[in-house]
């Protein structure tokens, strides 16, 4: 049994890091493998993660951690019984994938303005809370070409757009994702999408 693709890990910079790897053949990850991880810190202890299958030869493990700080470094040991298959390390702050924003809501009752709001996925005491920026994706269910991205580079989790920038009388969907420039993170997953019917009063044309 050998590791074909070494574990790569990403952290949500809160409580979970996710590591994925591939074996050289079909593997029952949960029964054959164990990933041991240990914070390099005074009086820390090794913790065991039981991996799950992620495709035939792929494995994934969700590592539970204390809230993360930038200096944290973890040692990782991948075991198959008594055989050490791979040894490495992981610095969560250098491999951050933020949590996805939640509670995306479209408020359509503000005089021809669409107000989209969502929730920051981090508690106020987490470093990322004040460092997230967002991308909002809006698309038409009827017209695949009607697909747009709005970059929200301010901290407030909201976006205002004129309803007239979208077509009237049709349904739209929106979703939002987050990233943090300070840690050069990857983008989060998209939030669940929300749907609304876009309708607004066409301005009266004078001739």
């Amino acid at each position: 049994m050998k590791v074909l693709q070494e574990p790569t890990c990403v952290s949500d910079y809160m409580s979970i890091s996710t590591c994925e790897w591939k074996m050289n053949g079909p593997t029952n990850c949960s029964t054959e493998l164990r990933l041991l991880y240990q914070l390099v810190f005074l009086l820390s202890e090794a913790h065991t993660c039981i991996p799950e299958n992620n495709g035939g030869a792929g494995c994934v493990c969700h590592l539970l951690m204390d809230d993360v700080v930038s200096a944290d470094n973890y040692t990782l040991d991948l075991w198959a019984g008594q055989q050490l298959l791979w040894k490495g390390s992981f610095k969560p702050s250098e491999h951050v994938k933020p949590r996805a924003p939640g509670n995306l809501t479209v408020h359509t009752n503000v005089s021809d303005t669409l107000l989209l709001t969502w929730s920051n996925p981090y508690p106020p005491d987490n470093y990322l809370y004040n460092h997230l920026t967002y991308a909002v994706n809006i698309w038409s269910e009827n017209d695949p070409a009607d697909f747009r991205i709005y970059n929200v580079t301010y901290l407030e989790p909201s976006l205002r757009i004129a309803a007239s920038t979208l077509k009237s009388g049709i349904s739209y969907r929106a979703r939002v994702r987050a990233w943090a420039q300070c840690y050069n993170t990857t983008w989060s997953e998209w939030s669940p999408s929300t749907k609304w019917h876009n309708s607004y009063r066409e301005p009266f044309e004078q001739h």
Partner: antibody
């Protein structure tokens, strides 16, 4: 309420032994690294010893290494410090301390302290 | 072993004034591992700040921490009568725990 209550302090002669206990309540002891910190009369804080959540790893300040032994009984939510070959300079108030996170984040819970006096 | 040196040894100020307490490490340390404690006579120490700048639960916002590398600061923006005490900085790191010798903040 999260609390730590030390006991076992007292007067002991140089070269003697003493065992301090710390009873934890309001939280699960096995989830945290635990420590002992001491303070000699009129002096500052001095780190003494620490132990990992399950007791598999220990750490000692150089001043007590080889003389003190830290241990824990997680099912009984109790921390111990066995002190032997005591010296006059070990005279201090001994505090039992919990760390904020599993391992780190500052010492957020302190006991009221138990006094150890080493004197002939 | 890393040594923490606090200054001044004693600081005499009046209520309402701003207090700035310094803690210098003998070598670079991570901001994640620097904490500050307050101790009043006859009482156990109380955690004020951890991770250099994060306030512990229940600590008023007049207390703030800053710094990096070897130089760290605890600031009390407007001194209240109950703030007069001894303050300790602490390194709680990957391989050791060390306290500074303390700064006594007294009423002028």
């Amino acid at each position: 309420e999260v609390q730590l209550l030390e006991s076992g302090g007292g007067l002991v002669q140089p070269g003697g032994s003493l065992r301090l206990s710390c009873a934890a309540s309001g939280f699960t002891l096995s989830s945290y690294a635990m420590h002992w910190v001491r303070q000699a009369p009129g002096k500052g804080l001095e780190y003494v010893s620490g132990i990992s959540p399950t007791g598999g790893s220990t750490y000692y300040a150089n001043s007590v290494k080889g003389r003190f032994t830290i241990s824990r009984d997680n099912p009984k939510n109790t921390l111990f410090l066995q002190m032997s070959s005591l010296r006059a300079e070990d005279t201090a108030v001994y505090y039992c301390v919990r760390v904020k996170g599993r391992y780190r984040g500052g010492m957020d819970v302190w006991g009221q302290g138990t006094t150890v006096t080493v004197s002939s | 072993e890393i040594v923490l040196t606090q200054s001044p040894g004693t600081l005499s100020l009046s209520p309402g004034e701003r207090a700035t307490l310094s803690c210098r490490a003998s070598q670079n340390i991570s901001t994640a591992y620097l904490a500050w404690y307050q101790q009043k006579p006859g009482q156990a120490p109380r955690l004020l700040i951890y991770g250099t700048s994060r306030r512990a639960t229940g600590i008023p916002d007049r207390f703030s921490g800053s710094g990096s590398g070897t130089d760290f600061t605890l600031t009390i923006s407007r001194l209240e009568p109950e703030d007069f005490a001894v303050y300790y900085c602490q390194l709680y790191g990957t391989s050791s725990v060390t306290f500074g010798q303390g700064t006594k903040l007294e009423i002028k």
